[in-house]
């Protein structure tokens, strides 16, 4: 039985992966922070974790993944005010009883250091020094990530 | 109700620097995409960049050797700096909270007039 | 950049007409992120409408925007006295922003 947040991520990543293929991202559009090899958008409204969800689908674009720790630190270097919490794309998978990234793969437990419970109605959110885990009715903050493309040399035979 | 208010010497001379300040009130600047502005007499606006509330800036190609942003999230101001001014610097210069791909250019502050002249 | 060009220059109407305001772009504008400004003589711009569509807080309902892609319209229902201004239309999907040259709707 899966929970009404797991289904409405369910259905927007089975959305975005239906979408016709784009060419790939070479420069981060307006408004957007580079990061490595990924665009951030912080938003400076506030919503629920399926609404985050849902508005960084309208942008072309998931709420933030976050590969290890390292990643993570360098995205809280980004969050400049201490009392901000950002939500990103982890939530508590019920009938998995683990957490569960919006790409459907699971946390590894090394990578995030998670306060609060592991529960039903449980997202991730993120602030400058910590990951904690929310209500995901909770209204705050979010960030929505687009992957740049690489830029590979192209290496032509001799003519 | 956010306020915005703009502040610099309303007259700076050719081949100098123009310095303007915009003071935020009524909300934090911790947020947002704080934004200049600028407008000519007589004639149509011009975006001259912006400055996150963390640093991190994007100006218009058009004026990015002469431009400089600042934000002090402490005093709730960010700055402007023009360097090596001419007589076509001379506009009406806008601050303003821009909101980005939700909700665009929503609060300015009333404008002040800079003048180019020796 | 993206060029806007907004139509017409000016237009000259009586209070109660409907005004129609085009602005047209060099190219697509992402995700429609066009919005329409109104200024008065003395005046900072004041934003009417963004999202191609979407009117701003506290902005009556007889002002509407429509409109994708290249082409966007804004138009007022009926004009009050207060709406005769000059109107911008601006696109913030690429960088850098760029602004159309204004339309003023003055008293016929």
């Known amino acids: 039985q899966k929970s009404s947040i797991e289904k409405c991520s369910v259905d927007i990543q089975q959305s975005r992966n239906k979408t016709t293929e784009r060419p790939g991202l070479l420069n981060c559009p307006i408004y957007w922070q580079q990061l490595r090899e990924k665009c951030l958008l912080f938003s400076h409204t506030v919503n629920p974790w399926n609404n985050s969800l849902a508005d960084c689908s309208t942008k072309e674009s998931s709420l933030l993944l976050i590969r290890d720790k390292d990643e993570l630190i360098h995205t809280q270097n980004l969050i400049r005010d201490k009392a901000i919490l950002f939500w990103i794309g982890l939530n508590f998978s019920l009938s998995e009883k683990n957490w569960k990234w919006i790409n459907g793969s699971f946390l590894n437990s090394n990578d995030l250091e998670i306060r609060g419970d592991a529960k039903e109605n449980s997202c991730i959110s993120i602030s400058q020094t910590s990951v904690y885990s929310e209500y995901c009715s909770t209204e705050i903050r979010w960030i929505c990530q687009k992957e740049l493309t690489p830029v590979r040399n192209k290496v032509y035979p001799d003519s | 109700q956010v306020q915005l208010q703009e502040s610099g010497p309303g007259l700076v001379k050719p081949s100098e620097t123009l310095s303007l300040t915009c003071t935020v009130s009524g909300g934090s600047i911790s947020s947002y995409y704080w934004t200049w502005i600028r407008q000519p007499p007589g004639k149509g606006l011009e975006w001259i960049g912006y400055i996150y509330y963390n640093g991190n800036t994007n100006y218009n190609p058009s004026l990015k050797s002469r431009v400089t942003m600042s934000v002090e999230t402490s005093k709730n101001q960010f700055s402007l700096k023009l360097r090596s001014v001419t007589a076509a610097d001379t506009a009406v210069y806008y601050c303003a909270r821009d909101g980005g791909p939700w909700v665009p250019l929503d609060y300015w502050g009333q404008g002040t007039l800079v003048t180019v002249s020796s | 950049e993206i060029v806007l060009t907004q139509s017409p220059g000016t237009l000259s109407l009586s209070p109660g007409e409907r005004a129609t305001l085009s602005c047209r772009a060099s190219q697509s504008v992402s995700s429609s992120y066009l919005a329409w400004y109104q200024q008065k003589p003395g005046q900072a711009p004041r934003l009417l409408i963004y999202?191609?569509?979407s009117r701003a807080t506290g902005i009556p309902d007889r002002f509407s925007g429509s409109g994708s892609g290249t082409d966007f319209t804004l138009t007022i229902s009926r004009l009050e006295p207060e709406a005769f201004a000059v109107y911008y239309c601006q696109q913030y999907g690429s960088s850098p922003p760029t602004f159309g040259q204004g339309t003023k709707v003055e008293i016929k």
């Open positions: 999202g191609a569509s």
